[in-house]
Interface confidence: medium
């Protein structure tokens, strides 16, 4: 029995859904009756999900696994995996047993972003040419192990002088510490760059060190000036920090965040104590830090309703406050691709190719091409809707008179994560080929 | 001395709405959440939501948090709570009570509100 | 929400002698935080609730020590050592750990 699963790794974001592919060619009369599916960890053996005497037997992995109940006499038995972890990453192999047995195993790599970089200074007030500071670069939640670069202000990279850690957490994420010590010029700015080589996504921040100002009445509450980018199901962390006086203590400080539009309260932590959620149960402070001016709140199993300006106040002695704004994103799907009519096609044969991509955020932007690359932008309609998460579904439509053969590719772009997922076919004479879906 | 002294007494049509004030004296009014808690006749204590002056956060009771508004004025150390959409269930004493987000030490002394036809 | 449930409705009393009022919550009252945001109030016929006792068993300023809080998790209780006269109305526990903040149904306090 021939078993086929796609031969790259199938990559998902962690606390994303992912699909692992798998199927069989079900011979004429093949009744579900008849199938044994096995799902399991290639390397340990251990049992993830299974099919038999025409039941599903549901999931033996943490209740986060379900097959397609509606395609498996179609002969697929692909396996969906919800809420993906670090944990779950590695090989799972795809048991089939009908009258003879046959195997496969497919790759699942884990993904997550890293957060923009945050950058500290130390010493960070009273500089002068000559003195020497150590420059931090801290970026978070993200997986596998990044690389980083450090550089100037002209793009010359710095690699003396540089040292970095990446500690995972209880959940496997790596938050990478660089630390640069440079001495200073009349001014300079240096540049991090925290690159994810699996999702080749480059987080930057920089740092231009010039004369200090000398401080104001009020507390200075600082937060990152670009909005906070975070993928839907991840967690997203709302930077806000401000710079306690010598002799600080907690039980002065008084911290709210809310909604900056509504107003409607998210958390706070007032008499020395946090007090707790407000917002869904889904946010945190970091405790440990609060006493060295970070108020920086967690927000969990980010939703696109989350989309929005979040506003930092801080109350010592004085009144400071900053939004900071949350822009919320999910990677489209790669796109599937259906011709109607699918079969005896011939040359002057008007089709019409639907390109459909799923569960993305924001909104898409679709484009056709054929087989040399030059766009098709007639006769091409595009619909996008909203599911009750806020996900958009993409729906493209080409209608095209065929020429003797040709290829017509679809690309679905977010905006927000610049992600392009792809999708061809290639219509021939006899037969159509689809490339497999990965 | 800590005082929460709430506006009079007011009699409702069904449907309309109703502004309850709360001025405050003898603390910070910014620095503290005051909170919202009605009493129907007979009846027991129900809290309607809570604001914090000085940052404007609110946080409602699901039971009123399409019905109920609560506001502050800083400049006058004045709280104020308006329920909209009005029916006779609403009728009763109203409170403002003073305190932290996750309690309330001083109360107003109650504003009665009659929602009749 | 939290269901807060005090017992009993009603507690007749002679001056001099003890009292005690129950109330239980529906669930937990410890915060994640790790307090537990229990309150008694009294309210005097035809005045406002006072604050009596927060956090479980802590006396409010100025509130005579004959009224003592005590209990954790769910169970929690008011006691009065000796009533006097001025210790009748209707006594409310009332809890701040889970939002909507929820009010026990309330024990009328009289003398016989």
């Known amino acids: 029995l021939e078993v086929q699963v796609p031969e790259d790794p199938v990559v998902a974001l962690v606390g994303t859904d992912a699909t692992l592919c798998c199927s069989f060619s079900p011979e004429p009369g093949f009744s579900l009756a008849q199938l044994n599916l096995i799902w399991q960890l290639t390397d340990t053996k251990q049992l993830v999900h299974s099919f038999a005497e025409g039941q599903d037997q549901g999931s033996a992995y943490a209740n986060r696994t379900a097959l397609f109940p509606d395609l498996l006499a179609q002969g697929n038995a692909s396996l969906r995996l919800q809420r993906v972890r670090v944990a779950d990453e590695g090989s799972f192999t795809c048991f089939v047993s009908i009258r003879d047995f046959g195997s496969a195993a497919v790759s699942l790599q884990v993904a997550a972003p890293y957060s923009k970089p945050s950058m500290t200074l130390e010493p960070n007030k009273d500089l002068r040419p000559g003195d020497t500071v150590t420059i931090t670069c801290s970026s978070y939640q993200g997986y596998p192990e990044a690389e980083v670069f450090w550089q100037d202000g002209q793009g010359v990279p710095l690699t003396g002088n540089v040292t970095t850690s990446q500690m995972a957490n209880e959940q496997g994420l790596f938050d990478v510490h660089s630390i640069l010590r440079v001495v200073l010029g009349a001014n300079g700015t240096y540049s991090c760059l925290v690159r994810n080589p699996v999702l080749q996504q480059d987080a930057h921040s920089s740092v231009t060190i010039t004369p200090q100002r000398s401080p104001t009445g009020a507390v200075e509450v600082q937060v990152p000036e670009d909005p906070v980018v975070a993928l839907v199901g991840t967690d997203a962390t709302l930077r806000c920090s401000f710079s306690p006086e010598p002799g600080f203590s907690l039980a002065q400080l008084n911290l709210i965040w809310q909604l900056t539009d509504t107003k409607q309260l998210v958390h706070s932590f007032t008499e020395g104590r946090d007090q707790g959620s407000a917002y869904a149960n889904r946010t945190a402070l970091f405790p440990d830090l609060l006493a060295q001016g970070n108020a920086s709140l967690r927000l969990q199993r980010v939703r696109v309703a989350d989309e929005g300006s979040f506003t930092c106040f801080v109350s010592i002695r004085d009144f400071g406050s900053a939004a900071v704004s949350l822009q919320v994103a999910a990677p489209y799907s790669k796109p599937s691709m259906t011709l109607e009519p699918n079969k005896d096609l011939r040359p002057g044969d008007t089709v019409t190719i639907t390109c459909s991509s799923y569960r993305g955020y924001p909104e898409a932007e679709v484009f056709w091409q054929d087989g040399q690359g030059v766009p098709l932008t007639g006769n091409v309609t595009t619909s996008q809707m909203a599911n009750e998460q806020g996900l958009f579904d993409v729906h493209s439509v080409l209608r095209v008179v065929l020429g003797a053969n040709g290829t017509y590719s679809c690309l679905v772009r977010n905006p927000v994560l610049q992600q392009d997922a792809h999708g061809s076919v290639t219509i021939t004479g006899q037969p159509m080929t689809f490339p497999p879906e990965a | 001395e800590v005082q929460l002294v709430q506006s009079g007494a007011e009699v409702k049509k069904p449907g309309s709405s109703v502004k309850v004030s709360c001025k405050a004296s003898?603390?910070?009014?910014?620095?503290?959440?005051m909170h919202w808690v009605r009493q129907a006749p007979g009846q027991g204590l129900e809290w309607i939501g809570l604001?914090?002056?000085?940052?404007?956060?609110?946080n409602y009771n699901e039971m009123f948090k399409n019905r109920a508004t609560l506001t502050v004025d800083r400049s006058t150390s004045t709280a104020y709570m308006e329920l909209s959409s009005l029916r006779s269930e609403d009728t009763a004493v109203y409170y403002c009570?003073?305190?932290?987000?996750?309690?309330?030490?001083?109360w107003g002394q109650g504003t009665t509100v009659t929602v009749s036809s | 929400d939290i269901v807060m449930t005090q017992s009993p409705l009603s507690l007749p009393v002679t001056p001099g002698e003890p009292a005690s009022i129950s109330c239980r919550s529906s669930q937990s009252l410890v915060h994640s935080n790790r307090d537990t945001y229990l309150r008694w109030y009294l309210q005097k016929p035809g005045q406002s609730p006072q604050l009596l006792i927060y956090?479980?068993?802590n006396r409010f300023s100025g509130v005579p020590d004959r009224f003592s809080g005590s209990g954790s998790g769910t169970d929690f209780t008011l006691k009065i050592s000796r009533v006097e006269a001025e210790d009748v109305g209707v006594y409310y526990c009332s809890q701040s750990t889970h939002v909507p903040y929820t009010f026990g149904g309330g024990t009328k306090v009289e003398i016989k």
């Open positions: 009570a003073g305190g932290g987000r996750l309690y309330f030490d001083y």
């Open positions: 003898g603390y910070t009014f910014s620095s503290y959440w």
């Open positions: 956090k479980v068993s």
């Open positions: 604001i914090h002056p000085w940052s404007g956060s609110t």
